[in-house]
């Protein structure tokens, strides 16, 4: 592995839609794949109403927005679908959202980020 | 990388089995990923089939499930396709391609698929 | 079976266009929705996965977006060589299903 490389071995699985999908609902899942891919986990979830529901948790391949993310972290304002990627062995158990804030001029009430959720 | 390549009898007659193999080149299919068979008929409607697993275990299409077998041959990197009791409506090109994960289901890897006649 | 619907089976667009195609799901699939390229010859490659993500050597004039149940695939600057069928494809709940393809033809 490449020295500071956080490498994938397994992440949190879990799918909201087990029982049609035919798998378990939740456990460990084994990130197994090509030498030359990164391996990454990830979690997605909603906002249904200030309640967290997560929609699936695993492992994900190869994806350059996960790179080196240590860190389960959504930045998008406010997406309907929240998804977060990271390195490194069951990084996806928690996950949060910080809305990265625009750039504008600074006023005199300065904004205060919201809140992250945490699983 | 990791290439797939379908092979199999270009014609079947009705009411018998089709079986078509898949040649995977650059990774062990023993390693990781799911190992599917999709479909492709004449109209361009795909319709995936099934799956066999890394580990062996297989998942089907509902709607074929009493006419499918996906299986593998570990030695030889190979994964396979049968086809019971075919009829002309099963004449498609036949694809064969990965996904990596569970929850990860993007197609990242094809073959170049063949085309199999049912007909008399 | 979750359905996937792309409501135009063939478009015809000018080199240098942006073209927008279409596909919608019977029901939400939270945005586990990929898109794929068929050639005329009949080769197949993934463009685009989870909605917008780009995958690894796909050319940045396409992109993704979408939501719920809606989703689209967008070719900027439409050049020769993006005249295909693209397929979007659901991946939230098994069996995995396909739109029925969106023909993209030179005007």
């Known amino acids: 592995a490449i020295l500071g490389r956080s490498e994938t071995q397994e992440c949190l699985f879990f799918n909201a839609n087990w029982e049609k999908d035919r798998t378990n609902q939740t456990g460990v899942e084994p990130c197994y794949g090509d030498k030359d891919k990164r391996r990454h986990c990830f979690a997605t979830w909603k906002n249904i109403s200030g309640s967290i529901e997560i929609v699936k948790q695993g492992c994900w391949l190869d994806d350059i927005n996960c790179y080196d993310r240590t860190d389960c972290v959504e930045k998008k304002d406010s997406p309907e679908v929240y998804f977060c990627c990271c390195e490194g062995n069951m990084c996806n158990e928690k996950f949060s959202y910080f809305p990265e804030m625009e750039v504008t001029q600074p006023t005199s009430n300065p904004v205060t980020p919201k809140p992250p959720y945490y699983n | 990388d990791v290439q797939l390549q379908e092979s199999g009898p270009g014609l079947v007659k009705p009411s018998q089995s089709l079986s078509l193999t898949c040649s995977v080149t650059?990774?062990?299919?023993?390693?990781?990923?799911?190992w599917n068979w999709i479909r492709q008929f004449p109209g361009n409607k795909l319709e995936w089939m099934g799956y066999?697993?890394?580990?062996?275990?297989?998942n089907y299409n509902p709607s074929l499930i009493n006419r499918i077998s996906i299986t593998r041959d570990t030695s030889k990197n190979q994964f396979f396709l049968k086809l019971n009791s075919v009829t002309t409506e099963d004449t498609a090109t036949y694809f064969c391609?990965?996904?990596?994960?569970?929850?990860?289901?993007?197609?990242?890897?094809w073959g170049q698929g063949t085309l199999v006649t049912v007909s008399a | 079976d979750i359905q996937m619907t792309q409501t135009t089976s063939s478009l015809s667009a000018s080199l240098g266009d942006r073209v927008t195609i279409s596909c919608r799901a019977s029901?939400?699939?939270?945005?586990?929705l990929n898109w794929y390229q068929q050639k005329p010859d009949g080769t197949v490659k993934l463009l685009i996965y989870?909605?917008?993500r780009l995958h690894s050597g796909v050319p940045s004039r396409f992109s993704g977006s979408g939501s719920g149940t809606d989703y689209s695939l967008t070719i900027t600057n439409l050049e020769q060589e993006d005249i295909a069928t693209y397929f979007c494809?659901?991946?939230?709940?098994?069996?995995?299903?396909f739109g029925g393809g969106t023909k993209l033809e030179i005007k």
């Open positions: 029901q939400d699939i939270s945005n586990f």
């Open positions: 989870f909605t917008s």
């Open positions: 494809q659901q991946g939230n709940t098994l069996p995995w299903t």
């Open positions: 391609a990965s996904y990596a994960y569970r929850n990860d289901v993007r197609f990242a890897y």
């Open positions: 066999i697993s890394y580990d062996g275990s297989n």
């Open positions: 650059g990774y062990s299919i023993t390693s990781g990923y799911y």
